[in-house]
């Protein structure tokens, strides 16, 4: 028998520095977790102790903190090289800055293979990107070889900016011939490494013949066997065993997100490549693991540029940006409108001639807007200003919801109106009218939404049974501020870009902003 140790990360999302337990900015260092310096300590410890070790990443290193905003992927290549990753799969967020923003900082600089079997380049891009990413790679590990085959969510064109010269094929259809090719090359130990979410990971394990292990990402799935060490609730045991259609027992793993855990899976293969045992657990990278001093010093060196960036002007406002709780928790506020407009703008994807865009709606809990921005400072808006407005380090995500769920959400928005509670919704692409004289749960008297399947966008009444795409904070997608109906009834959820980054990009693009209060939210009683 031959034993392989698979160390894996996914959805690190720019968390190069250690973070607090909830993966936001580290405040109390003695309680902080993750970060590449701490990760390196643990990886090196395992590499020294065990003979056959692979360090793999299942995508979405890009996007999530000011590190990505400033360094645009160069930081990913640099620190992944320093940690000596063996392979990485492309995630949807790797395309956030377009194909060029992937090629130059990451694909050309990475000293490890970057993989995806279901992304096919066409047109002029085909020759430009040729060899920079691969469908699979055969890696020597000790005296053996291991095949790694990559895959990426086929929803990427709706979630990021891959452009028109990349075709995202069905994962299973694309993977099978590559796995077959590996088999003809006498590679009998094959890992599928990819970024399509836990449900697809399980389908790949079930349907793609010849795959021995699936290492996934995208859905931030936490798996654990035994008592979990932190706040994350396991979605199943680690590894999660899937029985394939032909009867193979295929371990599927994922390691939550944000570099909080290092996935640790031990696989025993026989001489024919049969998996005869698999066991392990994610390792919580808490403060009991010291940060590696040399990596930490390098982080501190790179950090300097971030501090300078925070105070640089992104753009100007010529109006007061009202982000006060007195406004945003009670009525339409122009800061809410600005943020929602930025959220929609960040999700412009013209992927179908029938649609002007795939999504037109935004909702945003008023309680998530934490500060106004005064225009009487020469109109200057900085990253620092935006960090005061959006201090929680969240993401603006894409969900699919039925009209009936949206109606419940808007009823919840005003169910206890007047108490300055955070659930009051700011909107974009939505016109809502409330009648507060009616009983809670029956206060939405009009709810019109902006069409997407139209050449001239206009507002139409919400249809209860129709499925709509909506951009919202991850906080709401996870049921925050009492929006349990969103969490329970959402039909799809894809994590998006860092909140501050979305707004800062929009302001930089617009250069001068002047958001107004324009009648998106109305009260039929006339008293507001």
């Amino acid at each position: 028998a031959w034993e392989l140790t698979i160390l894996h990360t996914n959805d690190v999302h720019s968390r190069l520095e250690q973070t607090s337990e909830d993966s936001s900015k580290c405040v109390n260092a003695s309680r902080c977790m993750g970060g590449v310096a701490r990760l390196f300590t643990k990886v090196q410890q395992i590499r020294r102790a065990e003979p056959n070790v692979l360090l793999l990443d299942a995508g979405d290193q890009y996007q999530g903190t000011i590190w990505f905003t400033v360094y645009k992927g160069a930081e990913v290549a640099h620190f992944m090289n320093a940690l000596r990753y063996d392979a990485m799969a492309l995630g949807n967020h790797e395309f956030d800055n377009g194909v060029e923003g992937l090629i130059e900082p990451l694909l050309k600089e990475a000293k490890f293979p970057i993989l995806s079997a279901n992304i096919k380049a066409k047109g002029p891009l085909a020759s430009q990107i040729s060899g920079l990413y691969l469908p699979y790679k055969v890696l020597p590990v000790g005296d053996e070889v291991v095949g790694i085959v990559g895959y990426t969510s086929k929803e990427t064109p709706f979630l990021s900016n891959p452009g028109t010269n990349l075709v995202f094929e069905d994962e299973i259809t694309a993977l099978q011939p590559e796995v077959d090719k590996l088999k003809t090359l006498n590679v009998n130990k094959i890992i599928a490494l990819g970024h399509s979410g836990f449900e697809m990971d399980k389908l790949i394990a079930q349907k793609v013949r010849g795959v021995d292990v699936v290492v996934g990402g995208h859905s931030n799935t936490f798996l654990y066997t035994g008592n979990p060490p932190s706040k994350e609730v396991p979605a199943g045991k680690y590894p999660f065993i899937v029985t394939s259609d032909d009867g193979r027992k295929v371990p599927v793993v994922q390691a939550y997100a944000f570099g909080k855990y290092l996935g640790y899976l031990k696989i025993e293969f026989d001489e024919r490549g049969n998996v005869i045992s698999s066991h392990g657990n994610p390792i919580l990278l808490n403060s009991s693991i010291p940060e590696d001093p040399s990596i930490k010093a390098d982080i501190n060196k790179w950090r300097i540029k971030l501090d300078n960036y925070s105070t640089q002007e992104l753009g100007k406002t010529i109006v007061y940006l009202d982000g006060s709780s007195q406004s945003c928790r009670f009525r339409e506020c122009n800061m809410g409108n600005l943020i929602c407009d930025a959220m929609i703008n960040n999700n412009l994807r013209h992927t179908d001639e029938m649609f002007w865009n795939h999504v037109s709606m935004c909702i945003l809990n008023g309680g998530g807007i934490r500060s106004p921005i005064d225009e009487r400072n020469n109109g200057t808006i900085t990253w620092e200003n935006l960090a005061a407005v959006l201090p929680f380090g969240g993401t603006f995500d894409l969900v699919q919801l039925k009209g009936s769920t949206l109606k419940k959400a808007f009823e919840h928005s005003v169910h206890r109106y007047g108490q300055s509670t955070g659930e009051f919704l700011q909107v974009g692409g939505i016109h809502v009218v409330y009648d507060l004289s009616r009983k809670p749960g029956d206060r939405v008297v009009k709810l019109d939404v902006l069409c997407t399947k139209c050449r001239v966008p206009s507002y139409d009444p919400l249809k209860m049974d129709e499925v709509y795409k909506v951009i919202l904070p991850n906080f709401l997608a996870n049921g925050g501020d009492g929006f349990q109906m969103i969490k329970d009834e959402l039909l799809r959820h894809d994590s998006g870009d860092q909140d501050i980054n979305v707004v800062s990009t929009y302001i930089s693009k617009m250069k001068v902003i002047y958001p107004a209060v324009e009648g998106r939210i109305k009260f039929s009683t006339g008293s507001h």
Epitope: I241, T243, N274, I276
Partner: antibody, heavy 119, light 107 residues
Framework: QVQLVQSGAEVKKPGASVKVSCKAS????????IQWVRQAPGQGLEWMGA????????RYTQKFQGRVTMTADTSISTAYMELSRLRSDDTAVYYC????????????WGQGTTVTVSS | DIQMTQSPSSLSASVGDRVTITCRAS??????LNWYQQKPGKAPKLLIH???RLHSGVPSRFSGSGSGTDYTLTISSLQPEDFATYYC?????????FGQGTKVEIK
């Protein structure tokens, strides 16, 4: 070395049941499927089904569904195949074999157990 | 279920002869084709897996080829110990199925 040792020959009456054992040694018993194949006198090989001792998952062919039960006792690395409501045409040599799941070939076989069904 | 048809059902050959046995599947089995040898009163032995890969300890005079639905077992120079019955088996789709066998006899 890797081997499978089966229980001895059995003579049964029609309508009765038979339980054949297959003891594994020399490998990780819980890591491979145990396949059951039978061969009637002068005939070819017929796959009956399989069990994965690691989690007791089973697969039976349609023909034997409802009549065959495959079990495994991991504490003694032994698999069992029980066939009920025996008929005379169940007279055969019953083999257990270890299945390789990369190609679904059977690389190690037991010596076979002869089951005779006769009134 | 996938049907496996072997031909011939029996053949007579002499020591040193080149012998070819064919196996046809009722549908494409993607090279998941295995060959076994069985001698009277003994359990089958694996010879070749995945169309052409020799099982450990099997002499190199045995070889396999084929793709899609048609597969071949070749014995390049028949030896006295090779007189036996040969079975093909598909490992592509459950339930696993065997060919009816080819008996190789001494001429």
């Amino acid at each position: 070395q890797v081997q499978l040792v089966q229980s001895g020959a059995e003579v049964k009456k029609p309508g009765a049941s038979v339980k054949v054992s297959c003891k594994a040694s020399g490998y990780t018993f819980t890591g491979y499927w145990i396949q059951w194949v039978r061969q009637a006198p002068g005939q070819g090989l017929e796959w009956m089904g399989a069990i994965y001792p690691g989690d007791s998952d089973t697969r039976y062919t349609q023909k034997f569904q409802g009549r065959v039960t495959m079990t495994a006792d991991t504490s003694i690395s032994t698999a069992y195949m029980e066939l009920s409501r025996l008929r005379s045409d169940d007279t055969a040599v019953y083999y257990c074999a270890r299945g390789n799941w990369d190609d679904w070939d059977f690389d190690v076989w037991g010596q076979g157990t002869t089951v005779t069904v006769s009134s | 279920d996938i049907q496996m048809t072997q031909s011939p059902s029996s053949l007579s050959a002499s020591v040193g002869d080149r012998v070819t046995i064919t196996c046809r599947a009722s549908q494409d089995i993607s090279n998941y084709l295995n060959w076994y040898q069985q001698k009277p009163g003994k359990a089958p032995k694996l010879l070749i897996h995945y169309t052409s890969r020799l099982h450990s300890g099997v002499p190199s005079r045995f070889s396999g080829s084929g793709s899609g639905t048609d597969y071949t077992l070749t014995i390049s120079s028949l030896q006295p110990e090779d007189f036996a019955t040969y079975y093909c088996q598909q490992g592509d789709t459950l339930p696993w199925t065997f060919g009816q066998g080819t008996k190789v006899e001494i001429k």
